[in-house]
Interface confidence: low
């Protein structure tokens, strides 16, 4: 599952590129291993805002392709409780490549350790 | 078409145990979080907690935390507020809302009407 | 845990005039995690605004928020009847606060 959310992350990344998209989204660039649940939940959240902002039906669908292959994988490691982690808000706001690039990140640590 | 569907209204009495339900359709429910909201007659919203439905993590405002459970159904889309002891001061209207872009909420249920009275 | 005060607590105009709600924070938020709702009695809220500044769907555009760090500003341009309600302002994200409200009536 982790695998195919890679391949979406790519699919997006290839979809944005023809377009002018300014935001910035709240970004963790250096995930704690105690903190991924909660990272990863940050990075579901603020992926929304590019489908949001997008307005593209290809972005869209995959964004909502992605988040339900994320939720799934999460689920399957059980009721995860994380304390002493960040807020989104928290975080650094960067902009939407460096935001996927430090995505496939966090998803890599996941595949990591599962 | 994203709805939120509320059990309807309850009368109880001190003491009681209650399950609320918040049914949604028209987006995929682990999607989004889910949140409930109180508000006391002729009084403002109050956040009581929120929920993940694609783990179930689960978030309680300091004020409700052990005095509710908030529980999610993935297999019939549906959330839950519980009760295992009301009081006469959990009479209130109850919303259940999705958190949608950024977590604010931006579908609300129609509401259910608890009222706890000896 | 942010507190939120809206003020004024209650806000008399004729339709036609503006109206400015105003909503302060204890700390500061982010300006993307700060929403508008409206409820009309007997009704369930309705989001306004999100990200402090951004419609939400369906929502007319005589209504506009603004403001950043504690203080947050509704704005609704020319009243209609069906503007008078009652308008919290939210702190969402992680965490989740309303106000207390401003109920705006007619004068």
């Known amino acids: 599952n982790w695998v195919n959310v890679i391949s979406d992350l790519k699919k997006i990344e290839d979809l944005i590129q023809s377009m002018h998209i300014d935001a910035t989204l709240y970004t963790e660039s250096d995930v704690h291993p105690s903190c991924k649940v909660t990272a990863m939940k940050c990075f579901l959240l603020e992926l929304q805002v590019i489908s949001l902002e997008s307005g593209d039906a290809s972005i869209h669908d995959t964004v909502e392709n992605l988040i339900i292959l994320a939720n799934n994988s999460l689920s399957s490691n059980g009721n995860v409780t994380e304390s002493g982690c960040k807020e989104c808000e928290e975080l650094e706001e960067k902009n939407i490549k460096e935001f996927l690039q430090s995505f496939v990140h966090i998803v890599q640590m996941f595949i990591n350790t599962s | 078409e994203v709805q939120l569907v509320q059990s309807g209204a309850e009368v109880k009495k001190p003491g009681e145990s209650l399950k609320i339900s918040c049914k949604v359709s028209g987006y995929f429910f682990t999607t989004y979080w889910i949140g409930w909201v109180r508000q006391m007659p002729g009084k403002g919203l109050e956040y009581m907690g929120i929920?993940?439905?694609?783990?179930?993590?689960?978030r309680y405002s300091p004020s409700f935390q052990g005095q509710v459970t908030i529980s999610a159904d993935k297999s019939i889309s549906t959330a839950y507020l519980q009760w295992s002891s009301l009081k006469a001061s959990d009479t209130a209207m109850y919303y259940c809302?999705?958190?949608?872009?950024?977590?604010?909420?931006?579908?609300w249920g129609q509401g259910t009407l608890v009222t706890v009275s000896s | 845990e942010i507190v939120l005060t809206q003020s004024p607590g209650t806000l008399s105009l004729s339709p036609g005039r503006e109206a400015t709600l105003s909503c302060r924070a204890s700390?500061?938020?982010?300006?993307?995690?700060l929403a508008w709702y409206q409820q009309k009695p007997g009704q369930a809220p309705r989001l306004l605004i999100y990200g402090a500044s951004r419609r939400a769907t369906g929502i007319p555009d005589r209504f506009s928020g603004s403001g950043s760090g504690t203080d947050f500003t509704l704005t609704i341009s020319r009243l209609e009847p069906e503007d008078f309600a009652v308008y919290y302002c939210?702190?969402?994200?992680?965490?989740?606060?309303f106000g207390q409200g401003t109920k705006l009536e007619i004068k």
């Open positions: 809302a999705r958190g949608g872009n950024w977590n604010c909420f931006d579908y």
């Open positions: 929920i993940y439905p694609g783990d179930s993590d689960t």
């Open positions: 700390q500061s938020v982010s300006s993307s995690y």
């Open positions: 939210q702190r969402y994200g992680s965490s989740h606060t």
